[in-house]
């Protein structure tokens, strides 16, 4: 059974995630001129569920995707704090949190999403198993 | 309502210039890129750059930089494109278009007919 | 340059199914959308990202993806359904778009 200072660590690491990823889709919203919309172009696999950790295998495929969008919108005056180690950071905290004792073939969704939806999708991921770990 | 209104036909001789024009009106015409899209008689679509209005920002595809020029005036919602020397080639129906990551709204048009 | 490549033509019969592919070798990470444009008129778009239908287009057109490949399917296509059709969609830097080189649908 997880101990108190174990989920206090997953919950510590999902918030970190969680952040993260904020950060991205704020980068993308907040940016004032629309000029981004080419982004929108670029399309995401979503995982078919996403109720549990170990679903996580889901994002981490698709990080390397969202690094080339990422390091291609930074050419166009979208400025985010070095895509690289943002995304290996957030690599980082999704290998930890999903586990590596089990390795899970992610199950996709038919249906793909734009950057946008791609990053809503996982944040409320976050946020669902934040609330249930509180 | 979202439009796109472009100027009337023109008929040149190869070797004059042309500047036709494409008014947006119905939204914030400077926070959308305008695209130009070119199609030769009885031929396909063919992508010829886009303008961003807010800034000028310009991006041409290969097979058109350098033939054209695409500029906008930000102030009168209108993108223009321009031929410094036109071509019997160049003779085409040529429209406008509002990119949001494709291509949303169309102009209706306008033909250029380029004969000696 | 990259390209997109769609059969010249296809023809049904009323009522029939049509489908219109188009490849591109991008299209696994870039969304294919689709123009109808019918004679004398500008195209006016039926399907975006794939699948999703703009307001005011009829159900029976549809959009679907797969590896290097997208669709646009007709279901009982109607004589107004004849024109061209073009895919659509970006170069892997999204800066560039590419059409297709257009297919002209027939509804004999």
């Known amino acids: 059974a997880p101990t108190s200072s174990s989920t206090k660590k997953t919950q510590l690491q999902l918030e970190h995630l969680l952040l993260d990823l904020q950060m991205i889709l704020n980068g993308i919203n907040n940016y004032k001129n629309p000029k981004l919309t080419r982004m929108l172009t670029f399309k995401f696999y979503m995982p078919k569920k996403a109720t549990e950790l170990r679903h996580l295998q889901c994002l981490e495929e698709e990080l390397k995707p969202l690094e080339e969008v990422l390091n291609l919108a930074q050419s166009k005056s979208f400025h985010l704090r070095d895509t690289k180690d943002l995304i290996s950071n957030i690599n980082v905290i999704v290998l930890e949190l999903k586990g590596s004792e089990t390795t899970l073939m992610c199950e996709y969704a038919d249906e793909t999403a734009t950057i946008v939806e791609f990053l809503n999708r996982w944040i409320t991921f976050c946020q669902s198993i934040i609330s249930t770990l509180t | 309502e979202v439009q796109l209104v472009q100027s009337g036909a023109e008929v040149k001789k190869p070797g004059e210039s042309l500047k036709i024009s494409c008014k947006g009106s119905?939204?914030?015409?400077?926070?959308?890129?305008i695209g130009w899209v070119r199609q030769m008689p009885g031929k396909g679509l063919e992508w010829m750059g886009i303008i961003y209005p807010g800034d000028s920002d310009t991006r041409y595809s290969p097979s058109f930089q350098g033939q054209v020029t695409i500029s906008a005036d930000k102030s009168i919602n209108t993108a223009y494109l321009q031929w410094s020397s036109l071509k019997a080639s160049d003779t085409a129906i040529y429209y406008c278009?509002?990119?949001?990551?494709?291509?949303?709204?169309w102009g209706q048009g306008t033909l250029v007919t380029v004969s000696s | 340059s990259y390209e997109l490549t769609q059969p010249p033509s296809v023809s049904v019969s009323p009522g029939q199914t049509a489908r219109i592919t188009c490849s591109g070798d991008?299209?696994?990470?870039?969304?294919a959308y689709w123009y109808q444009q019918k004679s004398g008129q500008a195209p006016v778009l039926v399907i975006y990202?794939?699948?999703k239908r703009p307001s005011g287009i009829p159900e029976r057109f549809s959009g679907s993806s797969s590896g290097t490949m997208a669709t646009l399917t007709i279901s009982g296509a109607q004589v107004e359904d004849e024109a061209d059709y073009y895919c659509?969609?970006?170069?892997?830097?999204?800066?560039?778009?590419?059409f297709g080189g257009g297919t002209k649908l027939t509804v004999l």
């Open positions: 659509y969609s970006t170069d892997r830097s999204g800066d560039h778009v590419v």
């Open positions: 278009a509002r990119d949001t990551g494709y291509f949303d709204y």
């Open positions: 991008a299209l696994p990470r870039k969304f």
């Open positions: 119905g939204y914030n015409f400077t926070t959308y890129w």
């Open positions: 990202e794939d699948r």
